[in-house]
């Protein structure tokens, strides 16, 4: 069995989580991919997913989550913009491959969002960014409802951080329309 590891990202409110999930492009280029949150004792919950089949470099936005799947590179980019403290939790990138269970990409992400002025408009990119605009044309894809039953029976992965996931529902999934995110200059 693959050992599940976690990568801790500590960011401030208003910043952007920017994760690159690599995959074998020959196998998974056009497969549908998703961003999920994992709460203790629950099955992973899909927050956003790419279209099926996944479109090359075409941004999909659900609330404050933006997915971009780069087929040519074997890379799924996940961004959560304007982070809030309640976004803290455990996340993962997965590839849907029905009828098989989803294939997990990358390390799981332990996101810790703290209050306080970030100093940058919304990035964890060390201020090297000089242009950052959310694309005006984004689509929202319909995500499959199933999740892997096996994931539930796994022991929760050990974390280097003692961070609890908030009990309150994250608003990211309660969005029915595409939300326009303010442009950062």
């Amino acid at each position: 069995a693959t050992k599940l590891t976690e990568e801790k990202y500590e960011l401030k409110e208003g910043q952007t989580l920017d994760v690159k999930c690599d995959y074998t492009l020959e196998k998974f280029a056009s497969s549908q991919k998703a961003w999920q949150i994992i709460r203790d004792g629950e099955m992973p919950k899909t927050l956003a997913c790419t279209e099926r089949p996944s479109k090359n470099s075409h941004p999909v936005q659900v609330g404050r989550i933006i997915l971009e799947d780069y087929h040519d590179h074997g890379l799924l980019r996940v961004r959560m913009v304007n982070l809030q403290v309640e976004d803290s939790g455990l996340y993962q990138c997965v590839i849907y491959q029905p009828p098989k269970e989803p294939h997990m990409l990358f390390d799981r992400i332990r996101l810790v969002v703290t209050k306080g002025f970030s100093g940058t408009p919304g990035s964890n990119e060390n201020s090297t960014q000089n242009v950052y605009k959310i694309p005006p044309t984004t689509t929202k894809a319909l995500c499959p409802l199933y999740t892997s039953p096996r994931t539930v029976t796994q022991a929760p992965p050990k974390s280097t951080a003692d961070v609890s996931t908030p009990d309150s529902e994250i608003n990211l999934t309660n969005v029915t329309d595409i939300i326009r995110v303010p442009v950062f200059n």
């Epitope: 690159k20 690599d22 995959y23 470099s57 590179h73 890379l75 990358f106 964890n124 242009v131 950052y132």
Partner: antibody
């Protein structure tokens, strides 16, 4: 077959300017991030700048920020690097590369020499 | 800025032998690590991405491993065409940074 062909390199005096260009073919240019990576003679690789497909995101290494400008013309499948206020330490082979984070395809490079 | 450190600077290996190259990051880069090969007078070529995924057309003798801060590129049985300089690169955060390179030379 992916092809990236750089041009515009040459000898320039400190404080001068050069504009590098890259002609891309063999892939969907408008769907790809593009970057410039440089290599000083006998040295290692250094990332210079990256630009998203629609230029909505652009990143530079600190050493060139404010002096270099990366741009692209998707209609012409071309990538550019405008280099101003050049310094001796900018002397290098400049590679046009496909990708914004890691680099799948590389051109053969164009040599920029900054010397008086 | 994430600093990438490669070791050794030079590795002398006989053809057919195994070569193990190391790359260390000053802070965690998760699995966002790539390896490149560069031969004299040529542009670099992507070998490995995602720390362990072989790029298209790369022979199976090349393998990558590691996560976080410690990474390894292994060439299981060196062929004559494998003698070159190898670079690691992190792409977790901008600025993107490369290691200083490891030269694999014929013993």
């Amino acid at each position: 077959e992916v092809q990236l062909v750089e041009s515009g390199g040459g000898l320039v005096q400190p404080g001068g300017s050069l504009r590098l260009s890259c002609a891309a073919s063999g892939f969907t240019f408008s769907s790809n991030w593009m970057s410039w990576v440089r290599q000083a003679p006998g040295k290692g690789l250094d990332w210079v700048a990256s630009i998203k497909q629609d230029a909505s995101e652009i990143y530079y290494v600190d050493a060139v920020k404010g002096r270099f400008t990366i741009s692209r013309d998707n209609a012409k499948n071309s990538l550019h690097l405008q280099m101003n206020s050049l310094r001796a330490e900018d002397t290098a082979v400049y590679y046009c590369v496909r990708g914004g984070w890691r680099f799948e395809s590389w051109g053969q490079g164009t040599l920029v020499t900054v010397s008086s | 800025e994430i600093v990438m450190t490669q070791s050794p600077a030079t590795l002398s290996v006989s053809p057919g032998e195994r070569a193990t190259l190391s790359c260390r990051a000053s802070q965690s880069v998760s699995s966002n690590l790539a390896w490149y090969q560069q031969k004299p007078g040529q542009a670099p070529r992507l070998l490995i991405y995602g720390a362990s995924i072989r790029a298209t057309g790369i022979p199976a003798r090349f393998s990558g491993s590691g996560s976080g801060t410690e990474f390894t590129l292994t060439i299981s049985s060196l062929q004559s065409e494998d003698f070159a300089v190898y670079y690691c690169q992190q792409y977790k955060n901008f600025p993107l940074t490369f290691g200083g390179g490891t030269k694999v030379e014929i013993k």
